[in-house]
């Protein structure tokens, strides 16, 4: 039975040209983590295996950074990167599970003026 | 227990246009997530993808079929379609619906309608 | 496209016996590769996901290994009801696409 849950940052913005950290974490299991898959909608950004180690999809090696951990680091965002991530999580004996983060790129001035006033 | 469930006319002449529908059952085409995609398998068995919905509505299709082929669904009845037109007899083929993953393979296929392009 | 061969289009065995086929990737996919069982006049179905991963109810006697751009399937152990075409898929990038099949035949 599957009983892990994957906590995520959830929807997050960040400035245009800037970088963003995308972090999943698995807790609430005792599976063992064997392979995390990070994904877009239609394509793969990058594979962390406890094997192999990190690939990073071709299109994505001149801004894509892996880590911390087994998360994900985007960077020289662009609007196109606008959003749904995904992390895998493959496990053993549990299976996969799966988690969501929205990223919205916004531009300079946007995410400036949103910062200012972020309701507490 | 999530079931696809292909229909189609069967046989049509070339140069017309076909229109499939797919029937979803025990799952929301709208659960997050999930693509409902079209895939079809000629006879000598070789699968090629034509193109998905995802649950969000947006649309992506095969490159190689993009010219021909339209995607579009019906929500409230759980259903989405295929439209392909300027068929010719190379588009003879068992068309499948399925339902595809995060991780793009598809896990729940529906049985397959058998479509013919003959005059 | 990413071209997925499937060098053996038949191949012959016996119950019990271990049988492996083989799939090659025209590009690194790293691990995203996924099998699927078609048996005489049903659709395909799933057994192996990310190159190695069973999928829910798979029997045990099906594995997958491989990385980058050669990858295997193995039936440790045929049984009869095995009788089926089994593809490779790369779930790396789109457009997915698919081996030709390979069809494992019961002597």
């Known amino acids: 039975m599957m009983t892990g849950t994957i906590e995520t940052t959830g929807n997050i913005s960040a400035e245009k040209g800037g970088s963003i950290i995308l972090q999943c974490h698995l807790s609430s299991t005792t599976a063992q983590v064997t392979q995390v898959n990070w994904e877009q909608q239609d394509q793969l950004l990058a594979i962390c295996n406890a094997d192999l180690g990190w690939h990073i999809s071709p299109s994505f090696k001149d801004r894509v950074a892996p880590g911390p951990g087994l998360g994900l680091t985007l960077q020289s965002l662009t609007v196109n990167d606008t959003g749904e991530y995904f992390c895998i999580y493959h496990t053993y004996p549990d299976g996969t599970y799966t988690g969501r983060i929205f990223l919205e790129v916004l531009e300079s001035s946007v995410a400036e003026h949103g910062a200012r006033f972020q309701i507490p | 227990d999530v079931q696809l469930q292909e229909s189609g006319p069967g046989l049509v002449k070339p140069s017309q246009t076909v229109f499939l529908t797919c029937t979803v059952t025990g799952i929301s085409i709208t659960t997050g997530n999930y693509k409902w995609s079209w895939i079809r398998q000629f006879p000598g068995n070789k699968l090629e993808w034509i193109g998905y919905i995802y649950y969000s509505g947006t649309i992506t299709y095969n490159p190689s079929l993009t010219s021909r082929t339209t995607i579009t669904r019906d929500t409230p009845k759980n259903q989405f379609f295929l439209e392909m037109n300027s068929l010719t007899a190379e588009d003879t083929a068992t068309y499948y619906c399925?339902?595809?993953?995060?991780?793009?393979?598809?896990?729940?296929w529906g049985q397959g309608t058998t479509l013919t392009v003959s005059s | 496209d990413i071209v997925m061969t499937q060098s053996h289009k038949f191949m012959s065995t016996s119950v019990g016996d271990r049988v492996s086929i083989t799939c090659k990737a025209s590009q690194d996919v790293s691990t995203a590769v996924a099998w699927y069982q078609q048996k005489p006049g049903q659709s395909p179905k799933l057994l192996i996901y990310s190159a190695s991963y069973r999928y829910t109810g798979v029997p045990d006697r099906f594995t997958g290994s491989g990385s980058g751009t050669d990858f295997t399937f193995t039936i440790s152990s045929v049984q009869a009801e095995d009788l089926a075409v089994y593809y490779c898929q790369q779930h790396y990038s789109s457009p997915r696409t698919f081996g030709g099949g390979t069809k494992v035949e019961i002597k």
């Open positions: 399925a339902r595809e993953t995060v991780l793009r393979v598809f896990d729940y």
